[in-house]
Interface confidence: low
């Protein structure tokens, strides 16, 4: 959980002395744009509890990890919800404090309620100043429940919430009807996302068993420890007056944490500091009680005494929560005799120990050969052992030698020496060698002599065009094999460098010296010839060609087709990017144009000899579309089409073509010729009864023209299935052209 604490100073006699402080123990917290993370935010949240507007509150940033809110002028300024937001990225966390007016009509018996999913939550509002009106309960500012004033039990109004779920979380309030909202009792309900003792996405994981009132976080399984306790299971008490995940913060003032409310990230909520209780956290724990809100009982055995801040203080030879366990000499477990790391890495070294009392994080240390002592940054506590994790500073060669892990408890000491070998990542002393080159690839021998330590685990080849600022391309290869760099640009110089790695984290060495390798590009020598061409429309031409058969691979990247329009003095170039291609469709040509055509092979930027030219005449463009096409059903098998001739014809029409298709049908359309171009009407026969058809038509002069609009018409019913549609124009039957 994020190390974030919101402290409320409850010296309520003078609101001007009231302050809220948000303290972050996170690295770089609160420094905003000039550091690692976003700043701490501390503000009053007026979304649910609104108070009369007053002078703006003052925010003071006390250093890098603390922000304080002051400037409260009257008691009503204090009432409501305050929040502090800290942490960066996915760790951004909001801590909430709810402040009740001590002069309110209703006061909460307990402000923060943390319950598990499925539990029953009971909120209790104590009558402080009685009014004989209904009590309204609200949830997050919205009406929730009403109680009659007679329903008070023992001077309290209770709200029972059975089978609570996470969406039930939020701010609850109990208010006398027609009373000022500032006289409400405000509560905070936190519902963990899992049942008791469980955490994780499906609540399948078991909580570590948080001690001293710590609460298991339902997302990450970590214990959120009460103020004044630390450790992965909150097993360790801080010194009096200290708080924060590592006990690194100190309560301000001479009276320590007296009069302070501490709010921590959910699902903990708020409480007094360790050793204090009461609505204003100004009462010391009664004898035999300790911890936050004095909620814990000591029950010390074997002569232990109860300290209200830390619990049982055990006499020599005893330990445990209740001094119930006798001491045993600690022992370091399963320490490897030799470890290997790479130079300048920052490895994590684990050291596990068992014993009685159980070793905690601070009791295990790591000693380097130069005598420097490292303290662990993290500890994993298991039933049979504690594993301390050490973050080792950047390793230097002098760190090679014998290191020592040492554990010390009141039960005694143990230590284990182990050898650390610091290895130097390999650095190539020479550039890689070029073995062969082609137009688009280079074959390279990567393994060269190197300084530093082996064995070589991977070889990386970095390459990019010479004088380029683009990113380097990288290929990872087997140390024993030659490398082929593919998909290169022909006739281009490449800067090539080797990087060697040895096993382990940080085993990558520096890049070796660069060398220049240049790709090849021989001139294509083969002359293609044009085999044929076919006019596929007024502006489309399909061309085919061949190449002479020669032994060996084809030297070429593709073909260039050139069309010369002598009339207009224009050249059209068409690139065919496959050297295997032997045909191409040229589109978008000018109808009725005479073209000279040739083809040549190209390689890189070099062109081979051109084929002997061919001369092609494209037909002129077709006529415009017929106008006003109309369809009319005559019978169950006949539909009559009528139209008007196209306008602005470039010459006499040779025929019309009608296209017939069943509406919604998946089959190919049928084309029917109307060979008497002077006609403006025709009958399509042999159609199916009760069937919807689509028709369109176009005219032909030397080439086919544009299609007309499409018309739709259905044949009449009750006919037999026809053989297929045919056309009749003025009693003259026409053939079917599919």
């Amino acid at each position: 959980a994020v190390d974030l604490t919101l402290l409320a100073n409850l010296r309520l006699t003078d609101p001007q002395r009231f302050f809220l402080t948000c303290v972050s123990g996170e690295a770089g917290a609160g420094r905003g744009s000039d550091a690692w993370g976003p700043p701490l935010l501390l503000e009053k949240d007026d979304r649910i509890v609104r108070t009369p507007p007053g002078p703006p509150l003052r925010l003071a940033r006390n250093g890098s990890h603390q922000v304080t809110l002051r400037g409260f002028s009257k008691p009503s300024d204090l009432v409501g919800v305050f929040s502090c937001v800290g942490g960066a990225g996915a760790r951004r966390t909001r801590v909430i404090y709810v402040h009740n007016s001590p002069g309110a009509h209703l006061l909460p018996d307990k402000v923060t309620h943390t319950v598990n999913k499925g539990d029953t939550a009971v909120l209790s509002a104590r009558v402080h100043k009685e009014k004989q009106t209904d009590v309204i309960w609200k949830s997050n500012g919205s009406y929730f429940y009403t109680l009659d004033w007679h329903e008070a039990q023992d001077g309290r109004f209770l709200l029972q919430l059975p089978n609570v779920q996470p969406p039930s979380s939020g701010i609850y309030s109990a208010t006398y009807l027609e009373a000022s909202p500032l006289g409400s009792a405000f509560f905070r309900l936190i519902v963990r996302g899992c049942g008791a003792g469980r955490w994780g996405p499906g609540c399948t994981k078991e909580c570590p068993g948080c001690l001293h009132g710590g609460v298991c976080h339902d997302h990450d399984g970590e214990c959120v420890c009460p103020p004044g306790f630390t450790g992965t299971r909150c097993e360790q008490a801080c010194r009096e007056g200290r708080f924060g995940q590592s006990c690194q913060e100190q309560c301000p003032g001479i009276s320590g944490c007296r009069g302070l409310t501490f709010c921590l990230p959910d699902p903990y909520g708020c409480s007094c500091g360790s050793g204090w209780r009461g609505s204003q956290c100004q009462e010391a724990c009664a004898p035999g009680h300790f911890g936050a809100d004095c909620r814990l009982q000591c029950q010390c055995q074997n002569g232990g005494t109860c300290d209200r801040f830390s619990g049982c203080v055990c006499p020599s030879g005893w330990h445990g929560v209740h001094c119930e366990k006798s001491d045993r000499i600690p022992q370091i477990l399963n320490m490897a005799s030799e470890l290997e790391f790479n130079l300048e890495t920052m490895p994590r070294i684990n050291c596990a120990a068992a014993g009685n009392p159980f070793p905690v994080r601070g009791s295990i240390e790591l000693r380097k050969p130069d005598g420097t002592v490292l303290l662990s940054t993290k500890a994993i506590v298991e039933p049979e052992k504690t594993t301390a994790e050490f973050e080792v500073p950047r390793l230097v060669l002098a760190d090679s030698g014998f290191w020592e892990c040492r554990v010390s408890t009141s039960g005694g000491q143990d230590s284990r020496r182990f050898k650390v070998n610091v290895k130097v990542p390999p650095v190539p002393l020479a550039a890689p060698r070029l073995l062969t080159k082609q137009s688009r690839q280079l074959v390279v021998s990567p393994l060269v002599s190197f300084s530093g330590d082996g064995p070589i685990s991977t070889v990386r080849l970095h390459y990019r065009p010479q004088d380029s600022t683009m990113d380097w391309s990288t290929i990872v290869v087997d140390p024993s094999e030659n490398v082929t760099l593919m998909n290169l640009r022909p006739k281009t110089g490449y800067s090539v460098r080797v990087q060697l790695s040895r096993p382990g984290e940080g085993g990558e060495g520096a890049w070796g010296p660069p060398t220049l390798m240049t790709t090849d590009c021989p001139e294509p020598l083969l002359q293609p010839w044009l085999e044929g061409w076919h006019v596929e429309g007024t502006d489309r031409l399909r061309v085919s060609w061949s190449l002479p058969l020669v032994p060996g691979p084809l030297v070429g990247d593709g073909f260039l087709l050139r069309l010369w329009d002598g009339t207009r003095g224009q050249e059209r170039r068409e690139n065919v990017s496959s050297p295997q291609a032997r045909t191409a469709l040229l589109t978008g040509l000018t109808p009725g144009t005479h073209y000279q055509l040739d083809v040549q092979l190209y390689h890189c930027t070099l062109l081979g000899p051109a084929s002997p030219p061919a001369h092609v005449l494209l037909p002129p463009s077709g006529p415009p579309a017929p106008r006003h096409l109309h369809a009319q059903a005559l019978s169950d098998s006949e539909i009559q089409l009528t139209w008007k001739h196209p306008e602005a014809l470039p010459g006499p029409i040779s025929k019309y073509v009608v296209e017939v298709q069943v509406a919604g049908g998946a089959g190919d359309p049928l084309w029917i010729d109307v060979d008497r171009p002077e006609e403006t009407s025709t009958i399509i026969r042999g159609l199916n009864a009760s069937t919807r058809y689509l028709f369109r038509m176009r005219a032909s002069i030397q080439g086919l023209g544009d299609w007309s609009n499409t018309v739709e018409e259905s044949t009449l019913g009750n006919g037999l299935q026809a053989e297929g549609p045919v056309q009749e124009s003025r009693a003259a039957e026409e053939g079917l052209d599919q």
Epitope: A27, G28, R31, R58, A60, R61, N62, G63, S64, H65, R70, G71, Q248, Q250, P252
Partner: antibody, heavy 117, light 107 residues
Amino acid sequence: EVQLLESGGGLVQPGGSLRLSCAASGFTFSNYVMAWVRQAPGKGLEWVSVIYPSGGATYYADSVKGRFTISRDNSKNTLYLQMNSLRAEDTAVYYCTRLAVTHFDYWGQGTLVTVSS
Amino acid sequence: DIQMTQSPATLSVSPGERATLSCRASQSISSSLAWYQQKPGQAPRLLIYDASNRATGIPARFSGSGSGTDFTLTISSLEPEDFAVYYCQQRSNWPLTFGGGTKVEIK
């Protein structure tokens, strides 16, 4: 009794470097924010730099940012000020002080730094 | 930056008289203000913190008042050892800033 004892001052040429030290005793050094304050001859007090107990947070006056580095060694109860690229205007008595939340409650006797060619 | 302006620059007072020193902040600093006394050749000494709280061992004749932007240090009856330079300092915001000082000299 709280005591702060500065050392390391002296004469240095412009562009030179100097490292000041402050030995602390009589209180739990690792719990407190520490600072350096300087006073040019015949002038007022100017805050230079501050460092938080863990050493993880530091602040500098604009006039020294990028040239001075404050650090601490809690195991040795010692505060340091590494001064690089020194200028004539850095000539001053440098005081080591303890920052008690809002105020400097204890001061050392000061060490004189003279930057001159 | 918060500017701290002290007035007057020099105050001439006879022993036994009352001295009133003023310090003004360029923006509100609540009560985050301290007063220091400095004698020639010596380090400064804390007198008042949080605008009005006397530091340990400081005589009762020294008192501080004010909040927001205007603050006052009062020496009710000057003793011979009180003639010195007095500085105010704010801790409301970074950078920490001192006033230019008020020299209290014997009239």
